[in-house]
Structure formats: structure tokens, C-alpha cells
């Protein structure tokens, strides 16, 4: 807390500029008008204030806006955002994607902080759902964002948002998350033709049921082994040898290298030896 002292003669700030870096903390408190600071927030980032000086500027804004900062100020916080606590951020009403981007930029390259997480939560709740543009932005800054959400949270993602998802965004998703995302992806990509559809749906197939895998096996998709190994075991088990052969195409030879790992191991044990022998891979059921 900075003590209240009168501003020395001739030191009253007329604008936010570089001369302020030479002000002591108490001089900033006494000589910088909070309303002036709020209207010229965009200048603060161009000035090399110390952390202590930034604390004073934050204190002035807190006094001016005890109920939370307006978006016109939030958008231009820049590095001052790093001084905000989650409690501060919970008071904000952030509706503009540009504001969100500006603040995510400040934290770029770092792990998601509690401040950023709170900001994102406020933003998404304000919008009512995780729409495509928001998801696009969040996954650009935090590729693991989608897989950090619970299945319950993912259920509120509209199918249209799935277009923003890249394969790497799903790398750390667990089966229960893919169970929720797969039907949305199927709906989102339903009007694409066979080969294009497979390219888009491939990353989501860890949530696919048996009947959809059977349907894909009729379409010459040539699924790679990495994708096959991520399929749900319960979805793979009912597939016949012929269906797996069609599903994998030329990649079927890769089953030999994976014969001790799930779901391949469990699938092999379910097949008749005669059928396995037709593959010519030496798989033992």
C-alpha cells in the first residue's frame, strides 16, 4: 500500500510518457491521475517501468475501478496483465476476441498460468460456448487446451468448432474425451467425400464405435498403425480379420510388430487361427 502524499510542484503528469520512469513510487501515486492512466493504457507497455512502478499503476486502476476494469482498459493492459490475480480477473467482463488475443500474447511461450486460465474461463462463459474462433485462438496459443477439458466440459463444444481442431491438439486426449469429440467430428465432417473425410476424422477415431470402423473398412482408407493402436479395444474386438485387413490396407503387415500390445493382442486372441493365417504374418491366436 502506497502512502498518500501531495504531488510536488511541477510534477503532475499531463500524459503517460517516458519521464515517468524517473518518478519514485510515491510520486507516481501522487502525480498520475488514474483516469489519465486508464485512457492512455496503450502507452504503458512502451515505457520500461519497474515491477514496483507497475504495482503502483495497478493500485491506481484498482482504486478507479473497484468493481473490475472496463474492457477498453483490459485490452491495453499488456505486461500489467502479469500483475493481475485470478481474483482481479474474475471481476472482468471480457467479450472481445481481440482482447483475449492481446492478453494471451503477453503470456505467450509460457505454461498456462492461473491468470490466463481464469481469463479464458471468464471469456468462454461470457460467450456461452466454446465457439470456433475462440477454439482456434486457444489451440494456437495452447495446443493441449482441448485435451485439458473434461468430457463434461467438451460436451458443450458445438460440432462447428471441430473444424478448428488440428491433429496435434488431440495428442494428449484420453479415450473418454475422444468418446465425446468423435460424434461431433462425425457430424461436422459428414458432407465430405470418402478420402477427405478420413483425413479429417482420423485424429478423432479413438472415440469411434465398431460399426463406424466396419464402415470405414469398406472405403479403402489404409489406416496407419499409429491410428489403429489408438482405437478403443472394445470397438476393435468384434472386427473380422477381413475387415481389419481392408481397414489397414498395405499397413496390415505392421500388426506383427504390435502383436503384444493392445488392442492388437486382444483382437488376435479373439480370432480363429485359420483366419489369422490368411494374413501370412505368423500371428498366433
Amino acid at each position: 500500500e502506497v502512502e498518500k502524499t501531495a504531488c510536488p510542484s511541477g510534477k503532475k503528469a499531463r500524459e503517460i510518457d517516458e519521464s515517468l520512469i524517473f518518478y519514485k513510487k510515491w510520486e507516481l501515486e501522487a502525480c498520475v491521475d488514474a483516469a489519465l492512466l486508464a485512457t492512455q493504457m496503450d502507452r504503458v507497455n512502451a515505457i520500461p517501468f519497474t515491477y514496483e512502478q507497475l504495482d503502483v499503476l495497478k493500485h491506481k486502476l484498482d482504486e478507479l475501478y473497484p468493481q473490475g476494469y472496463p474492457e477498453s482498459v483490459i485490452q491495453h493492459l499488456g505486461y500489467l496483465f502479469l500483475k493481475m490475480s485470478p481474483e482481479d480477473i474474475r471481476k472482468w467482463n471480457v467479450t472481445s476476441l481481440e482482447t483475449l488475443k492481446a492478453l494471451l500474447e503477453v503470456n505467450k511461450g509460457h505454461e498456462m498460468s492461473p491468470q490466463v486460465a481464469t481469463l479464458i474461463d471468464r471469456f468462454v462463459k461470457g460467450r456461452g460456448q466454446l465457439d470456433k474462433d475462440t477454439l482456434d485462438t486457444l489451440t494456437a496459443f495452447y495446443p493441449g487446451y482441448l485435451c485439458s477439458l473434461s468430457p463434461e466440459e467438451l460436451s458443450s463444444v458445438p460440432p462447428s468448432s471441430i473444424w478448428a481442431v488440428r491433429p496435434q491438439d488431440l495428442d494428449t486426449c484420453d479415450p473418454r474425451q475422444l468418446d465425446v469429440l468423435y460424434p461431433k467430428a462425425r457430424l461436422a465432417f459428414q458432407n465430405m467425400n470418402g478420402s477427405e473425410y478420413f483425413v479429417k476424422i482420423q485424429s478423432f477415431l479413438g472415440g469411434a464405435p465398431t460399426e463406424d470402423l466396419k464402415a470405414l473398412s469398406q472405403q479403402n482408407v489404409s489406416m496407419d498403425l499409429a491410428t489403429f493402436m489408438k482405437l478403443r479395444t472394445d470397438a476393435v474386438l468384434p472386427l473380422t480379420v477381413a475387415e481389419v485387413q481392408k481397414l489397414l490396407g498395405p499397413h496390415v503387415e505392421g500388426l506383427k510388430a504390435e502383436e503384444r500390445h493392445r488392442p492388437v493382442r486382444d483382437w488376435i486372441l479373439r480370432q480363429r487361427q485359420d483366419d489369422l493365417d490368411t494374413l501370412g504374418l505368423g500371428l498366433q491366436g
Epitope: 485470478p86 498456462m112 492461473p114 486460465a117 481464469t118 479464458i120 474461463d121 468462454v124 487446451y145 485435451c147 485439458s148 477439458l149 473434461s150 468430457p151 463434461e152 466440459e153 494428449t172 484420453d174 479415450p175 473418454r176
Partner: nanobody, 124 residues
Framework: QVHLVESGGGSVQAGGSLRLSCAVS????????MSWFRQAPGKERERVAY????????IYAASVKDRFAISRDNAKNTVDLQMNNLKPEDTAMYYC?????????????????WGQGTQVTVSS
């Protein structure tokens, strides 16, 4: 091993407030959840508030929405439940719960670790 200890329960008049706190130790998962459940006598254990431990998203039961607020305090390593405008029907034993490694705190069966509980009694 995750260890959860609740505190802050007690008796309060309807319309009053309480703040429950759950001290968390041994929780290292960056992907997971913390929740507050409650159980009234003769009723099923129900989840009232959820917080995603990585992205701090929150979910509330319809019956407590806009009255309860769950938050994580990194410095103290606690997960708190601020309960405002309490009603007699909020009377229950309140439990802190943690989920990780594919557990998402959606149901009581979907929890990895439980606290011992703290009693909240709201009288009219």
C-alpha cells in the same frame, strides 16, 4: 498419495455464508479435477462444484449456481468453496474430492481420493 483435509463447516442461519477449505497435499497431476460433493442423510452423494485443475474451468450443480463459488489458491495449496445465501436444503456433509489419470470428477464413482468431510448445517 493424495491427502485431502476439509475445514470451515459449521452451523449458520438461512441467508448466511460459509467458506469451506480443502487442504491438498500430494496432488501432482496437471490434468485432473477437484470437486466438492455433499451428502444429506438418506440421500445420494451429489457433486455441487467442480474445478478443472489445469484450465480452472468451473461447473456447478443447478441448485447452487450463482450462490456457490469454487476456487483454487495456489499459494496455500487449497481448493475453497465460498457458499453464500445458504438455504436449509444445503444442510449436508460436504466432501472434497480429487480426480486424475482419466478420472474427471463427474460422479462419486469417478473420484480418486476423498477427504473425511465437514458438516454444514443451515437452520431457518
Amino acid at each position: 498419495q493424495v491427502h485431502l483435509v476439509e475445514s470451515g463447516g459449521g452451523s449458520v442461519q438461512a441467508g448466511g455464508s460459509l467458506r469451506l477449505s480443502c487442504a491438498v497435499s500430494g496432488y501432482t497431476s496437471s490434468r485432473g479435477c477437484m470437486s466438492w460433493f455433499r451428502q444429506a442423510p438418506g440421500k445420494e452423494r451429489e457433486r455441487v462444484a467442480y474445478i478443472n485443475m489445469r484450465v480452472l474451468t468451473t461447473i456447478y450443480a443447478a441448485s447452487v449456481k450463482d450462490r456457490f463459488a469454487i476456487s483454487r489458491d495456489n499459494a496455500k495449496n487449497t481448493v475453497d468453496l465460498q457458499m453464500n445465501n445458504l438455504k436449509p436444503e444445503d444442510t449436508a456433509m460436504y466432501y472434497c474430492a480429487a480426480g486424475y489419470n482419466g478420472q474427471w470428477c463427474e460422479h462419486a464413482s469417478d473420484v480418486t481420493a476423498w477427504g473425511q468431510g465437514t458438516q454444514v448445517t443451515v437452520s431457518s
